[in-house]
């Protein structure tokens, strides 16, 4: 907390400019009007303030807006955003995607901080659902964002948003998350033809039930082993040797390299040896 002292004669700030970097902390506190700061927030980022000076500026804004900053100020916080605590951010009402982008840009290249997580949470809750534009923005900054959400949070993703999801966005998703996302993807891509559908749905197949895998096996999709390894164990176990052969097509030979790994190991174990032998891969049940 900076002590309240009178502003020295002639030092009262008329605007936010570079001269302020020479002000001591107490001078900033005494000589910079909070309302002026709020209206000229966009200038703060162009001025090389020290961390200590930024603390003073934040303190002034906190005093001016004890219930939380208005979006007009939030959008121009820039590096001052890094000074905000999750508690500060919980007071905000961020509705503009441009504001969200501006603040994410400040944190770009770093892992998701508690501040950013709180900001995103506030934004998404304010919108009521994770729409396509928001998802596009978030996954651009944080490819792992989708997989950081709980299954309950993912249930608010409308099928239309699924079009924004790239394969790499699902890399760290676990089965419970894919269980939620797969039916949405199936709905989103339902009007596509066979080969195009498979290209789009492939990343989501970790949530597919047995009957959908059986249906895919009839469509000459040639699923690669990496995708097969991500399938649910309970969905793979009931597949016959013939169905797996059709599902994988020329990639079926890859089963040999994965025979000690789940779910391939579990599937092999439950097949008749005579059926496995038809693959000619030397798989032992």
């Amino acid at each position: 907390e900076v002590e309240k002292t009178a502003c020295p004669s002639g030092k009262k700030a008329r605007e936010i400019d570079e001269s302020l970097i020479f002000y001591k902390k107490w001078e900033l506190e005494a000589c910079v009007d909070a309302a002026l700061l709020a209206t000229q927030m966009d200038r703060v980022n162009a001025i090389p303030f020290t961390y200590e000076q930024l603390d003073v500026l934040k303190h002034k804004l906190d005093e001016l807006y004890p219930q939380g900053y208005p979006e007009s100020v939030i959008q121009h916080l820039g590096y001052l955003f890094l000074k905000m605590s999750p508690e500060d951010i919980r007071k905000w009402n961020v509705t503009s995607l441009e504001t969200l982008k501006a603040l994410l840009e400040v944190n770009k290249g770093h892992e998701m901080s508690p501040q950013v997580a709180t900001l995103i949470d506030r934004f998404v809750k304010g919108r009521g659902q994770l729409d396509k534009d928001t998802l596009d923005t978030l996954t651009a900054f944080y490819p792992g964002y989708l997989c950081s959400l709980s299954p309950e949070e993912l249930s608010s993703v409308p099928p239309s948003s699924i079009w924004a999801v790239r394969p790499q966005d699902l890399d760290t998703c676990d089965p419970r998350q894919l269980d939620v996302l797969y039916p949405k993807a199936r709905l989103a891509f339902q009007n596509m033809n066979g080969s195009e559908y498979f290209v789009k749905i492939q990343s989501f197949l970790g949530g597919a039930p047995t009957e959908d895998l059986k249906a895919l096996s009839q469509q000459n999709v040639s699923m690669d082993l990496a995708t097969f390894m991500k399938l649910r164990t309970d969905a793979v176990l009931p597949l016959t040797v013939a169905e797996v052969q059709k599902l994988l097509g020329p990639h079926v030979e890859g089963l040999k390299a994965e025979e000690r790994h789940r779910p391939v190991r579990d599937w092999i174990l439950r097949q008749r040896q005579d059926d496995l032998d038809t693959l000619g891969l030397g798989l032992q049940g």
């Epitope: 419970r176 309970d234 176990l237 000690r260 174990l269 439950r270």
Partner: antibody, heavy 119, light 107 residues
Framework: QVQLQESGPGLVKPSETLSLTCTVS??????????WSWIRQPPGKGLEWIGY???????NYNPSLKSRVTISVDTSKNQFSLKLSSVTAADTAVYYC???????????WGQGTMVTVSS | DIQMTQSPSSLSASVGDRVTITCRAS??????VNWYQQKPGKAPKLLIY???SLQSGVPSRFSGSGSGTDFTLTISSLQPEDFATYYC?????????FGGGTKVEIK
């Protein structure tokens, strides 16, 4: 409610073969989803998986014990068994049998039986 | 074989504390990691399977996360009955390895 019960001698001489049986009650050893494992825990130490068997007779063993281990299943008696040959004092441990549901993990365990290797 | 390294090997905590135990696999085990709790003289009990799924009957204060090589077991608010040893285990590779265990003791 599936329950498992280990049985067998509590004392085995060095160089002999340790033999234990696990009896499955309240369920079937022939269950489609389940694998039946043996796991051991030396006194004051951590858990070591020994191997599993499927009702079809297919087995999988810990590579470090493979040369000495045999696990078998008797579906008519609803039992599976462990044989560990050429034992030494290092094989002294609590031996557990456990069911592994392919979709979860070792969800049901026996209460364990202490086997001491000593002359 | 995939080696599982747990840390810390022991920790002291108080009732109500948030406790985090980590497990690192020597190579990817995807999301195939299970967590067990063992009390002295008793058989282990399955808490979490497939990295983050809560086993039926296990209190919701237990949660798991992670994929690939890094996994975490979290107890959100430690209860008196939670003082025990915790083990991670990977069933992805056929070698079925366990971590060395983490003993959670009363501070």
């Amino acid at each position: 409610q599936v329950q498992l019960q280990e049985s067998g001698p509590g004392l085995v001489k060095p160089s002999e073969t340790l033999s234990l049986t696990c009896t499955v009650s309240g369920g079937s050893v022939s269950s489609y989803h389940d694998l039946w494992s043996w796991i051991r825990q030396p006194p004051g130490k951590g858990l070591e998986w020994i191997g599993y068997i499927y009702y079809s007779g297919s087995t999988n063993y810990n590579p470090s014990l493979k040369s000495r281990v045999t696990i078998s299943v008797d579906t008519s008696k609803n039992q599976f068994s462990l044989k560990l040959s050429s034992v030494t004092a290092a094989d002294t441990a609590v031996y557990y049998c456990a069911r592994e549901d392919a979709l979860t993990g070792f969800d049901i365990w026996g209460q364990g039986t202490m086997v001491t290797v000593s002359s | 074989d995939i080696q599982m390294t747990q840390s810390p090997s022991s920790l002291s905590a108080s009732v109500g504390d948030r406790v985090t135990i980590t497990c690192r696999a020597s190579q990817s085990s995807r999301y195939y990691v299970n967590w067990y709790q063992q009390k002295p003289g008793k058989a282990p009990k399955l808490l979490i399977y497939a990295a983050s799924s809560l086993q039926s009957g296990v209190p919701s204060r237990f949660s798991g996360s992670g994929s690939g090589t890094d996994f975490t077991l979290t107890i959100s608010s430690l209860q008196p009955e939670d003082f025990a040893t915790y083990y991670c285990q990977q069933p992805y590779d056929a070698s079925y390895t366990f971590g060395g265990g983490t003993k959670v003791e009363i501070k």
